[in-house]
């Protein structure tokens, strides 16, 4: 079954078109923008989601200090090239023949160049640091309760096994969620940490990608956890290659 049988929709991706034209009249859903068939029992890849988004109408601290190679997605939205499996192609180019290399979450990891730019392989993002600031509350959340609820959220909403949630740090009002997933750890069927982080980011912004499921309602011991801002850092298995010009 590739989608909900009864009304033929995709619970995990509302940016799809679904129809009962799969094998044996089964419901099959295809991502907007690319037309790629998606598995509605799990998260859709970030690449296909970005493509669909671009095709849609425009409407002494315990906290971790990201290391020097951490990437932040400063380039914003672009219309990506995805491979047949829905992964980002290592080289991305725009309509004016400006090209750059990206990592597995689609974030630029080199200076921009021209069509002669080579990106030999898609470099895996194996460590993601999600940095959140929550709205003021009467008192700080209990750290272990917060930790447990966030781990359960990533497991039950984003289908990410807790073994990939490396740590949850908390220093009111800052929460940091560390996701780690090496190539060797990721088995067939495992959700990619990049996809889970993207779904979470969209949820936090009130732009849920889920169909028919309510928006994110995160509570810790009954107390709502409302996020004011999010910053996501990406660390790749191979450090990025930027010229010194960018670093100054």
């Amino acid at each position: 079954h590739t989608a909900a049988q009864d009304n033929c929709t995709c619970p995990t991706n509302k940016m799809t078109v679904c129809s009962p034209d799969g094998p044996g009249g089964r419901c099959q859903c295809r991502a907007l923008g690319s037309g790629v068939a998606v598995d509605c029992s799990t998260l859709t890849s970030k690449c296909l989601l970005l493509k669909a988004r671009m095709s849609a109408p425009k409407n002494a601290r315990t906290l971790v200090r990201p290391n020097e190679h951490a990437l932040v997605d400063n380039d914003g939205l672009y219309d990506p090239d995805c491979d047949p499996e829905g992964r980002f192609k290592a080289r991305q180019c725009n309509q004016t023949s400006v090209c750059w290399c990206v990592n597995s979450v689609g974030v630029r990891r080199t200076d921009k160049g021209d069509l002669s730019l080579r990106c030999d392989e898609l470099v895996r993002t194996h460590h993601i640091l999600i940095d959140l600031r929550h709205r003021p509350t009467a008192s700080a959340f209990n750290h272990s309760d917060l930790d447990a609820e966030l781990r359960r959220l990533f497991r039950e909403r984003y289908r990410l096994h807790p073994k990939f949630v490396a740590a949850v740090h908390y220093e009111q009002p800052t929460i940091q969620i560390e996701l780690r997933q090496n190539t060797s750890q990721k088995a067939a069927g495992d959700v990619d940490i990049g996809d889970a982080a993207y779904y979470f980011e969209r949820d936090v912004k009130g732009e849920s990608l889920f169909q028919g499921r309510g928006g994110l309602d995160l509570r810790v011991r009954g107390e709502p956890l409302q996020v004011e801002r999010t910053l996501i850092y990406y660390l790749d298995e191979i450090p990025p290659k930027f010229s010194m010009k960018r670093l100054t």
Partner: antibody, heavy 118, light 109 residues
């Protein structure tokens, strides 16, 4: 790969008891362990769960406060039970998830019997 | 997320067919498992994700369903199928009393 429970006993009402689940042949850190019990002639009842990675614990509403799950070594998980009553008489099973994000239990121990009686 | 399983007991002859129903109080998005338990033994996972057969389980066992309604059908009943069957929602462990259905005893005549 296997799981084995131990520590089941005949105890008095009001007593406490700790059960142990020992894992063999696999890395516990890649899984979650759930405890399930079954009273004689009755159905399965979920007690609680521990995400080994991170150590977070979760309990059925009725089990909160009286039951506590913890990882005690690289191969063992315990279930501590307090203020036991006759209603807690059951076979207690530990089970492992299948390594996916769902709670499918594809490996179970044989169970250990706890009898609460005066 | 209460799981209501029916019937509590069913009796069918060898070669017959049995259908067990399981209803969740809320949508569990096909995250449902079926287990078989024989006396003195722990439960054994038969079906996961509502319809996927665990390795080694005969194709006579068939799971179906979505949303809140699920079924387990056992066809061509054999004596070895005599057991108690349980459904389990595998979607959440938050704020629940039990993730298992009440069980169905299958008697093979």
């Amino acid at each position: 790969q296997s799981l084995e429970e131990s520590g089941g006993d005949l105890v008095q009402p009001g007593a406490s008891l700790t059960l142990t689940c020992k894992a063999s042949g696999f890395d516990l850190n890649n899984y979650s362990i759930l405890w399930v019990r079954q009273a004689p002639g009755k159905g399965l009842e979920w007690i609680g769960c521990i995400y080994i990675s991170g150590g977070s614990t979760y309990y059925a509403n009725w089990a909160k406060g009286r039951f506590a799950i913890s990882k005690t070594s690289s191969t063992t998980v315990t279930l501590q039970m307090t203020s036991l009553t006759a209603a807690d008489t059951a076979t207690y099973f530990c089970a492992r998830d299948d390594g996916t994000a769902s709670y499918y239990l594809n490996l179970w121990g044989p169970g250990t019997l706890v009898t609460v009686s005066s | 997320y209460d799981m209501t399983q029916t019937p509590a007991s069913v009796s069918e002859p060898v070669g017959g067919t049995v259908t067990i129903k399981c209803q969740a109080s809320e949508d569990i998005y096909k995250l449902l498992a079926w287990y078989q338990q024989k006396p003195g033994q722990p439960p054994k996972l038969l079906i996961y994700a509502a319809s996927d057969l665990e390795s080694g389980v005969p194709s006579r066992f068939k799971g179906r369903g979505s949303g809140t309604d699920y079924t387990l059908t056992i066809s061509d009943l054999e004596c070895a199928d005599a057991a108690t069957y349980y459904c389990q929602q595998a979607y959440t462990i938050g704020n629940i009393d039990n993730s298992f259905g009440g069980g169905t005893e299958v008697v093979v005549k």
